[in-house]
Interface confidence: medium
């Protein structure tokens, strides 16, 4: 059974991940971002199901395309360069889902825009955090 300290650590990691994802979304949604139209043409795979930490495998697998789109944007709205943002997210995701578990991600048939993709994972983080508090 998870201890209160491990639950607290998980909660903090999820909050960190949530902040990173929200920062990216805010940078993209900034009305001054001239590349938003181009960024919205890129398609992201969405998880069929995202209710447990192991489902973060689906986010991990989409971090490379996410980094590519952020590279293209190279927006001044981001305080961190894309590589550092992705590195931060990747490390948190690996810790949360556990690197030993081999979970095969199942994706929904419909692809999504970067905004829909980020909103989906933001909702996921918020949902898990609410069950921990």
């Amino acid at each position: 059974a998870p201890t209160s300290s491990s639950t607290k650590k998980t909660q903090l990691q999820l909050e960190h991940l949530l902040l990173d994802l929200q920062m990216i979304l805010n940078g993209i949604n900034n009305y001054k971002n001239p590349k938003l139209t181009r960024m919205l043409t890129f398609k992201f795979y969405m998880p069929k199901k995202a209710t447990e930490l192991k489902h973060l495998q689906c986010l991990e697998e989409e971090l490379k395309p996410l980094e590519e789109v952020l590279n293209l944007a190279q927006s001044k709205n981001f305080h961190l360069r894309p590589r550092d943002l992705i590195s931060n997210i990747n490390v948190i995701v690996l810790e949360l889902k556990g690197s030993e578990t081999t979970f095969m991600c199942e994706y929904a048939d419909e692809t999504a825009t970067i905004v829909e993709f980020l909103n989906r994972w933001i909702t996921f983080c918020q949902s898990i955090i609410s069950t921990l508090t």
Partner: antibody
Framework: EVQLVESGGGLVQPGRSLILSCAAS????????MHWVRQAPGKGLEWVSG????????GYADSVKGRFTISRDNAKNSLYLQMNSLRAEDTALYYC?????????????????WGQGTTVTVSS | DIQMTQSPSTLSASVGDRVTITCRAS??????VAWYQQKPGKAPKLLIY???SLERGVPTRFSGSGSGTEFTLTISSLQPEDFATYHC????????FGQGTKVEMK
């Protein structure tokens, strides 16, 4: 089919120059960083140089800095390596390789497509 | 340049064995490590990128782990076609390869 074909290798005397070329096809060349990697006979791999998709960022291994120059012509889907002041230790099979990540400006990722290499022999 | 030290340099194993190759960076490279397989007379083939992400089309018996300075490539059950040389590479600052690990038949 994604393909990289190197050319320009050969036998050259120490101190002389050589230009290697790499012709790319089957992918959007100007989206990706590109690299030169070499392998001396019976040895491991050595990264030589890399260039970002828009030529805005260029890097070299310490062993070739100041002697080698990487460049690309996106209109011709071509990558080049100008090798000056060649030394015996530059003798190797030179591979052209495509980076994995699109639009990387400051850095490199991993190399997912490689050519078959062109041999450079530096000897008197 | 960041140094990448691979161990062992040669590894003798049999089909079905679990094989582990280690790579140590001279300074932290975060998760920016790739692993390649190379067979004699052939160009290297990308297996793992970003320390643990499996390249498309690579069998799931290959896995990578680690972050910071310590990285591992594991082959869960060695197959006849896996006898080759394996190279690690950091791409945090420029790029540097390890010296290679030859996996040979015991």
């Amino acid at each position: 089919e994604v393909q990289l074909v190197e050319s320009g290798g050969g036998l050259v005397q120490p101190g002389r120059s050589l230009i290697l070329s790499c012709a790319a096809s089957g992918f959007t060349f100007d989206d990706y960083a590109m690299h030169w990697v070499r392998q001396a006979p019976g040895k491991g791999l050595e990264w030589v140089s890399g260039i970002s998709w828009n030529s805005g960022s260029i890097g070299y291994a310490d062993s070739v800095k100041g002697r080698f120059t990487i460049s690309r012509d996106n209109a011709k889907n071509s990558l080049y390596l100008q090798m000056n002041s060649l030394r015996a230790e530059d003798t190797a099979l030179y591979y052209c390789a495509k980076d994995q990540l699109r639009w990387g400006t400051y850095y490199y990722y991993g190399m997912d497509v490689w050519g078959q290499g062109t041999t450079v022999t530096v000897s008197s | 340049d960041i140094q990448m030290t691979q161990s062992p340099s040669t590894l003798s194993a049999s089909v079905g064995d679990r094989v582990t190759i280690t790579c140590r960076a001279s300074q932290s490279v975060s998760i920016w490590v790739a692993w390649y397989q190379q067979k004699p007379g052939k160009a290297p083939k990308l297996l793992i990128y970003k320390a643990s992400s499996l390249e498309r089309g690579v069998p799931t018996r290959f896995s990578g782990s680690g972050s910071g300075t310590e990285f591992t490539l594991t082959i869960s059950s060695l197959q006849p076609e896996d006898f080759a040389t394996y190279h690690c590479q950091q791409y945090d600052t420029g790029a540097t390869f390890g010296q290679g690990t030859k996996v040979e038949m015991k």
